[in-house]
Amino acid sequence: DSSKWVFEHPETLYAWEGACVWIPCTYRALDGDLESFILFHNPEYNKNTSKFDGTRLYESTKDGKVPSEQKRVQFLGDKNKNCTLSIHPVHLNDSGQLGLRMESKTEKWMERIHLNVSERPFPPHIQLPPEIQESQEVTLTCLLNFSCYGYPIQLQWLLEGVPMRQAAVTSTSLTIKSVFTRSELKFSPQWSHHGKIVTCQLQDADGKFLSNDTVQLNVKHTPKLEIKVTPSDAIVREGDSVTMTCEVSSSNPEYTTVSWLKDGTSLKKQNTFTLNLREVTKDQSGKYCCQVSNDVGPGRSEEVFLQVQYAPEPSTVQILHSPAVEGSQVEFLCMSLANPLPTNYTWYHNGKEMQGRTEEKVHIPKILPWHAGTYSCVAENILGTGQRGPGAELDVQYPPKKVTTVIQNPMPIREGDTVTLSCNYNSSNPSVTRYEWKPHGAWEEPSLGVLKIQNVGWDNTTIACAACNSWCSWASPVALNVQYAPRDVRVRKIKPLSEIHSGNSVSLQCDFSSSHPKEVQFFWEKNGRLLGKESQLNFDSISPEDAGSYSCWVNNSIGQTASKAWTLEVLYAPRRLRVSMSPGDQVMEGKSATLTCESDANPPVSHYTWFDWNNQSLPYHSQKLRLEPVKVQHSGAYWCQGTNSVGKGRSPLSTLTVYYSPETIGRR
């Protein structure tokens, strides 16, 4: 309604004697700002005076605040929005109705707020979820319809009078919608909390008790059980009787059914709190428990392990591992069902008792071929001795033994012969399936274990074979001792160490890498001419004419081998130099004359120098000296010098004659 002032605040506020009250409040006046505000206690409208009567707790006008008898009331609002109030302390006789008389320039309004002040602090209220189940987390809420900035309080949780360890979350609200203090506690109740008292205690800032609320926990849980057995150790012999009793120590709600389980499986027709087992057999050994159910679910007792004792049953042997590899370790395990466990064992190998072996396991750290055979055992406990079972077979596998390589040929073997070898062995488990040969070659294996080498090489020094099953055993290599003609024959210069210069002393060596047999002869030749029969060929003073292609031959009783042709190069300074002239030694002026420096040198001439008849050097570095155009003044004797890495050589003088042209003669 547009003719009303609009207020928002809690409808009723609660407090107790000596505490305080904080009244959150907002408003919107019809027009303009607030000019006057009076706070009445239990106001009544007087029709005669057209004013409100009642105790004035607080008053303010446009002239300013009128001093109040009581400083305990404070208007914390403003002239247009906020109308928040505080009363501190609050008294029992403040209960009733508070009237907020608001006046603006043209409008008036009375807003009423209820205040409920009790003589003592009122208790908080505990809120529980509708159902609590064991081990399921729940939130307990403690709510107090009070909060005031000037009067701090705290809420504490207790279980059976003892503060609870879990951390509570406290929140307060001081808004125009609600005023409260709330504590929330997250808690996972156990079945043992059923029936216990939970308290929410209101305390002042110093922890002094003010009030509380209590509730009794109703924790739904599955039945909690205890099992008792006679005899108490649950150890009996076959034929004895056993009684088990199931007791319910707690159940909420009441239990509905009872059953018994053995090794997790339900026993049929056993639905009472007592289980009687008469004349038990060994098959009845196992883990027993009782199960009682209610609406929450089934509860199980702890397990009782019933042991029915009996003498060992016929034994079996387990081998880790068969087949076993020679040199590996093997473990034999004697397996026999018995209760109590066997205390003594007797072991047999191929029917013969193994002395000193009385344990459940027999360990052989290094298996040998003779360990193969049948292993069996007998187990014994306090109730008797079992029977010997069928036993287990140990298969010991090993590489082929005593492998040898045998040459079938008559000796000696020559390069190019066909050689046959066989690979022999003594024993093997499993059987030999293949053979290997070293070194590898493109050789024939006409039958298993036989090798045929066609055209045997000079370098086939040794051959070894291996006989293989799962492993290969190698024989010692046998020497073929192949005889062959000398190999890798080559000419080697012994001296000089550097290049050969004309006049040097030169020695050539005929080298070869190997020969079998070792006794050899040498031959030297140059251009088909026999030079000597020693391993060395010597020149006291080499000349350029000794240069050429040299070969040496080495022979033994098998054959002879020649070296590659070796070129003997003799280095010498330029020699036999001469200057040739083109087109000739007589040239007409104005034409072109080319002088060429011809020489014999090794290495070839690298640098030419030209000289005139006065021995003056000309600026040319090439083999040819080109004069174009040639002049009469160029007539004269020329010579050249050739240089290589060995030295220099010079030519004799060659004369160039340049004659006048007909034109020049005509001019004269």
Epitope: D612, Q616, P619, E628, Q633
Partner: antibody, heavy 127, light 111 residues
Framework: EVQLQQSGPGLVKPSQTLSLTCAIS??????????WNWIRQSPSRGLEWLGR?????????DYASSVRGRVSINVDTSKNQYSLQLNAVTPEDTGVYYC?????????????????WGQGTMVTVSS | QSALTQPASVSGSPGQSITISCTGT?????????VSWYQQHPGKAPKLMIY???NRPSGVSNRFSGSKSGNTASLTISGLQAEDEADYYC???????????FGTGTKVTVL
């Protein structure tokens, strides 16, 4: 200090003769360890050796095959200078022309490099 | 007679080293040890920097060095400086009737 000073016209008409002179100071044109060279430079042909003259017991000259037949190098011993004559020029002969010394003796051994250059003459062949 | 082949341009930062190659044939670079190198600044005459493959004329900085392998000669400038920015030409004596041949030239830029 050896210096080479060039002189001669910068503009020559096509088919005419180009004449340039190179005056030597600090050395002799008659030196028997030097040669006296002409080299030209143009954007299209780069650096190009044209020819040389030198004196040993008599005068010798050598020319590049690209200009042989229309080039001659002459010497004036009294003025210690040498000159280049290039006949029947064409616009292709436009470029900067340099005279240069080649000192052929480096101590006792042979050497070969253009160690002293003239300042250069820009020659344009155009009608 | 063909000109000797040089890279058109080479660049480097101050303090760096650069190398310029000069490739010819067995009739010129490969046949004689008469390779020389020239520096030319714009509008100036060439200046001799290296002669006879690896010799330095007096007055030329030892930052300039020359070498030859087979038919290829090289000029190396170490500790590059701003004043080294110029054109560089190689030259060789040749066995042809045109006695000397020059390289195509390399522009060196100092970054």
């Amino acid at each position: 200090e050896v210096q080479l000073q060039q002189s001669g016209p910068g503009l020559v008409k096509p088919s005419q003769t180009l004449s340039l002179t190179c005056a030597i100071s600090g050395d002799s044109v008659l030196s028997n360890s030097d040669t006296w060279n002409w080299i030209r430079q143009s954007p299209s042909r780069g650096l190009e050796w044209l020819g040389r003259t030198y004196h040993r017991s008599t005068w010798y000259d050598d020319y590049a095959s690209s200009v042989r037949g229309r080039v001659s190098i002459n010497v004036d011993t009294s003025k210690n200078q040498y000159s280049l004559q290039l006949n029947a020029v064409t616009p292709e002969d436009t470029g900067v022309y340099y005279c240069a010394r080649d000192r052929l003796q480096d101590g006792n051994s042979w050497s070969d490099a253009f160690d002293v250059w003239g300042q250069g003459t820009m020659v344009t062949v155009s009608s | 007679q063909s000109a000797l082949t040089q890279p058109a341009s080479v660049s480097g930062s101050p303090g760096q080293s650069i190398t310029i190659s000069c490739t010819g044939t067995s009739s010129d670079v490969g046949g004689y040890n008469y390779v020389s190198w020239y520096q030319q600044h714009p509008g100036k005459a060439p200046k001799l920097m290296i002669y006879d493959v690896s010799n330095r004329p007096s007055g030329v900085s030892n930052r300039f060095s020359g070498s030859k392998s087979g038919n290829t000669a090289s000029l190396t400038i170490s500790g590059l400086q701003a004043e080294d920015e110029a054109d560089y030409y190689c030259s060789s004596y040749t066995s042809s009737s045109t006695l000397y041949v020059f390289g195509t030239g390399t522009k060196v830029t100092v970054l």
